[in-house]
């Protein structure tokens, strides 16, 4: 029996998730856990409930989804802790040393735990059909369950690198882990592509003092772009880089800024528009930057937020370590850059030390950036 | 009783392999992850990695990947480790262990193999 | 990965004697996954404390340990002849779990 539809998720306050699919008892799960670089995942509230719940939807595990799931989670009552009637988590407490978010934003209780203040006692994710959390059920330590989440904390990450270019990327990265939205990438995490003329090009996402940043790349794309423009970090020509009012679209390529006319690229210190462009209508204002789209600021911090909530501080078990994984791959042509799997299994390194094999997989998209990695 | 039985002293060339086994009993084998631990002579213990039988999902230590394999016969409850590409730095006493409650400390060895290359 | 680091690496205590040897990482280890083993040439390690200051099965009362973070401590009340051996920290808060390089307690 093998792990066959493993998943995992991350949010952009630096915090990702796996879901794994393998009868365990409670124990082994922590174990794996770890073994992973992470531990076994609180689901305490807010944007940390919403990131399981989105790998959950991604799809049923080995099954099918005919029936219901059990998923370890950090959630344990302690030996000469009492069952609390009135609490939303009835005297069970998340094992980490997080502080507490709003523990009445919590899942259910899908049967009231056993009224006792002497043995302890574990708790599991319930999950209808495998991929609707229906709440939480006590459950003995001892017994397995069908699967298990864990979590793992970043301090920083790396945007995601713009293709230009590039096709054929594929990705590598720390613990099953992927986001496919490509939003960001934890450090550890390998993306190579083809550039023009089917040249290899490979860059590690790395941490240092500073932050987190792209090792080996030059420049703010994987591969270069032959003309001026880009359009969601890829090469386009000027005729693609209108929107559907008419605006201005594109962001110019390294080496040229935007034009006085606020719809075209030209060389950089020319200040005139050397290509055609100057009758097409714009709704919108001029860009005082080198390029009309927002760059992105990096290397981001967790920090940073990137917009979002940030889900709790990084928690007692923290991740550094290198398991191994699955090669995941995008076609360039895709406009989202979705991705699809290759069935091998590769290893990567992450910032310190273990590696983790057996993984068949490919994916599909969820929100937020859940990833599939069941058998092919 | 739980009981982890290894397999005997083993002399080899370098650049050969080597394949040791650990056998267990009194213990549901394929609940709980075997780790494997090298000592060097006076030396202190590395912890090598790790193999869960029941899915035979593994862990390395960065370390030894590539130069140990682990796997395991659930059939037989043995757990085996082979070392490939000897070298005088693999001789060592390696030991197999696992965790049975006590918050993965390693609370069962086996007795150790010894390699000497 | 985390380092821990023993001192003193040798240690002579007389019979009777109060010893203590430390145990410091790298970076914050949790107390759960901090544990000690005892060694004796040729043979395996043994458990000896488990969780930071839990004693195994079979380990007498005299061996307690403390700590918490980056610092922990292995302490014998009144040392006995059996006690001569290697003791080994171990972390498994972070993978890869990792050993300290132990310390040899002596007969003086």
């Known amino acids: 029996e093998h792990p066959t539809a493993d998943r995992a998720g991350c949010s952009a306050s630096g915090a990702c998730y796996s879901l794994h699919h393998a009868t365990m008892k409670r124990q082994a799960a922590e174990e794996a856990c770890i073994l992973r670089g992470g531990a076994l995942s609180t689901v305490r509230a807010g944007a940390e409930l919403r990131a399981v719940l989105a790998l959950l939807r991604a799809g049923p595990g080995p099954g099918g989804g005919s029936k219901d799931l059990l998923f370890w989670v950090a959630l344990e009552r302690r030996r000469s802790h009492c069952t609390l009637e009135n609490e939303p988590l009835r005297g069970f407490s998340w094992l980490s040393s997080d502080p507490g978010g709003l523990e009445s934003d919590t899942l259910q209780w899908v049967e009231e735990p056993q009224r006792s203040c002497t043995a302890r006692r574990c708790a599991v994710l319930q999950a209808t059909g495998g991929v609707e959390p229906a709440g939480w059920k006590e459950m003995r330590c001892h017994l397995r369950a069908n699967g298990y989440l864990c979590k793992y904390q970043f301090e920083v990450l790396c945007p995601a690198p713009r293709p230009g270019a590039a096709s054929n990327l594929s990705y590598r990265a720390p613990f099953q882990l992927h986001s496919a939205a490509l939003d960001f990438s934890p450090p550890g995490t390998e993306v190579s592509a083809l550039c023009r003329g089917q040249l290899p090009i490979s860059v590690t996402c790395i941490a240092d003092e500073i932050g987190a940043r792209w090792d080996k790349l030059s420049g703010d794309v994987l591969c270069p772009c032959p003309g001026r423009y880009l359009r969601a970090g890829k090469c386009a020509e000027l005729p693609n880089c209108l929107d559907d009012l008419g605006g201005f679209a594109c962001e110019c390529a390294t080496g040229f800024e935007l034009g006085k006319d606020g719809r075209s690229c030209v060389t950089s210190g020319e200040g005139q528009p050397t290509l055609g462009g100057t009758g097409v209508p714009t709704r919108r204002p001029p860009a005082t930057a080198t390029s009309p789209v927002p760059q992105r600021t990096w290397p981001i911090r967790v920090d940073e937020k990137l917009g979002e909530t940030p889900l709790v501080p990084e928690q007692d078990n923290s991740v550094t370590s290198i398991p191994e994984i699955p090669r995941w791959g995008s076609q360039s042509t895709m406009s989202t850059l979705q991705m699809s799997l290759q069935a091998e299994s590769k290893a990567t390194i992450t910032p310190s030390g273990s590696v983790i094999s057996k993984f068949n997989s490919t994916t599909s998209s969820a929100t937020p950036q859940a990833f599939d990695s069941s058998s092919a | 009783e739980v009981q982890l039985q290894q397999s005997g002293t083993v002399l080899a060339r370098p650049g050969a392999s080597v394949k040791m086994s650990c056998k267990a009993s009194?213990?549901?084998?394929?609940?709980?992850?075997m780790h494997w631990v090298k000592q060097r002579p006076g030396q202190g213990l590395e912890w090598i990695g790790a193999?869960?039988?029941?899915?035979?999902?593994?862990s390395y230590n960065q370390k030894f990947k590539g130069k140990a394999k682990l796997t395991a016969v659930t059939s037989t409850s043995t757990a085996y480790m082979e070392l490939s590409s000897l070298t005088n730095e693999d001789s060592a006493v390696f030991y197999c262990?696992?965790?049975?409650?006590?918050?993965?400390?390693?609370?069962?060895w086996g007795q150790g193999t010894s390699v000497t290359v | 990965q985390i380092v821990l680091t023993q001192s003193p690496a040798i240690m002579s205590a007389s019979l009777g004697e109060r010893v203590t040897m430390t145990c410091t990482a790298s970076?914050?280890?949790?107390?759960?996954?901090l544990h000690w083993y005892q060694q004796k040439p040729g043979s395996s390690p043994k458990l000896w404390i488990y969780?930071?200051?839990n004693l195994a099965s079979g380990v007498p009362a005299r061996f307690s340990g403390s700590g918490s973070g980056t610092s922990y401590s292995l302490t014998i009340s009144s040392m006995e002849a059996e006690d001569a051996a290697t003791y080994y920290c171990?972390?498994?808060?972070?993978?890869?779990?990792?050993f300290g390089g132990g310390t040899k307690l002596e007969i003086k």
């Open positions: 009194g213990y549901t084998f394929t609940s709980y992850w």
């Open positions: 262990t696992h965790y049975y409650g006590s918050d993965y400390a390693m609370d069962y």
């Open positions: 969780s930071t200051s």
């Open positions: 193999i869960y039988p029941g899915n035979s999902d593994t």
């Open positions: 970076s914050s280890v949790s107390s759960s996954y």
């Open positions: 171990h972390q498994y808060h972070r993978s890869p779990r990792t």
